[in-house]
């Protein structure tokens, strides 16, 4: 029997992918593993092999199709398996009845542009990347903006809760350099959580205007 | 090797009771994911209720939800199925099933490794 404390936990970014986490106390570094993907209503499966990320866990990426293709539906149940190679044979280490709108991590936003600066505010704009259809405009974004001085986990959140791809930051420091980030969550699904951060933007706001001599 | 008896099946009314105990011997039941599974006459095997090994989640299918109740006892090493508001739909064989690994599935029955040699439970007035 499998020893130890194990923990399974996969994400479905909505189109083509479903990457996975598996940790288990007490496995060996050097065995071969990997995620199967069985779902139950439709003619294709899928595997990855699973890779280490540290010493007693290991990740991989279901790829099902074309980064945009829509391969599930919130109707489908994929069973997860972990199994790994014993001698010569495979064997199931861990198992989940994987319901992907239920768990969903979409990527994190893409094409981060300054769309007009002045001395105290910027308007940013970005898009979202691999996101299905279904969720027409049912998202919400956070974003963050990095001060001089500052840490990213210091900067305060600014939420929004509607399908806004841009944002328009406010009383700014002149002449000074920043950097912003967004991430963006579906309102559906129990498990589904934020996407990463995305790629910094940075950008400097305008110097202020010299005053003139009297 | 391990080895799963099912009992407490029988005839019951329908909107009546039953709970089935599933006895497992070779092994204990915190290494293995258990398994609920029936089959009705004509139709496929389909997943009822599972718990998971190690951290006891427990998991229904839609069906049974709010009907049936899974449970253990590691002391008596036996899995229970409690099972109310019952329906002639429920008419089936019940398995008790388990799977050296961590996790369970009601989608998939044949990732079980152990099985049970069944116990009818009919719903008939």
């Known amino acids: 029997a499998v020893n130890g404390t194990s923990q399974f936990t996969c994400f479905y970014n909505s189109r083509a992918n479903i990457s996975c986490v598996w940790s288990q106390d007490g496995a060996l570094q050097d065995t071969s593993c990997q995620v199967h993907a069985w779902p139950d209503r439709r003619r294709w499966n899928q595997t990855c092999e699973l890779l280490p990320v540290s010493q007693a866990s290991w990740a991989c990426n279901l790829i099902l199709g074309a980064p945009d293709s829509q391969k599930l539906t919130t109707v489908d149940i994929v069973t997860l398996r972990v199994l790994c190679r014993e001698g010569v044979r495979w064997r199931v280490m861990a198992i989940q009845d994987f319901k992907p709108f239920e768990n969903l991590r979409l990527m994190a936003p893409i094409s981060l542009q300054v769309v007009h600066v002045e001395t105290h505010r910027c308007n940013i704009s970005w898009e979202i990347s691999q996101a299905s259809h279904y969720f027409e405009r049912h998202l919400e974004f956070e974003a963050r903006t990095l001060s001089p001085g500052h840490t990213w986990e210091e900067a305060p959140l600014l939420t929004l809760k509607q399908k806004q791809e841009w944002i328009c930051l406010e009383t700014l420091t002149p002449d000074t350099q920043y950097e912003f980030q967004v991430r963006v969550k579906p309102l559906q699904g129990e498990f589904t959580t934020w996407s990463p951060w995305s790629q910094p933007l940075a950008f400097r706001t305008k110097p202020a205007a010299l005053g003139k001599d009297t | 090797q391990v080895q799963l008896v099912e009992s407490g099946g029988g005839l019951v009314q329908p909107g009546g009771s039953l709970r089935l105990s599933c006895a497992v011997s070779g092994g204990t039941l915190h290494d293995y994911g258990i398994g609920w599974i029936r089959q009705a006459p004509g139709k496929q095997r389909e997943g009822v209720s599972c718990?998971?090994?190690?951290?006891?989640?427990?998991y229904y299918a839609d069906y049974v939800k709010g009907r049936f109740t899974i449970s253990k006892d590691n002391a008596k090493n036996t899995v229970y199925l409690q099972m109310i508001s019952l329906k002639p739909e429920d008419t089936a064989v019940y398995y008790c099933?388990?799977?050296?690994?961590?996790?369970?599935?009601?989608?998939?029955?044949?990732?079980?490794?152990?099985w049970g040699q069944g116990t009818q439970v009919t719903v008939s007035s």
């Open positions: 099933a388990a799977v050296d690994a961590y996790g369970c599935s009601l989608v998939q029955p044949t990732t079980y490794d152990y």
């Open positions: 718990m998971s090994r190690s951290d006891d989640k427990t």
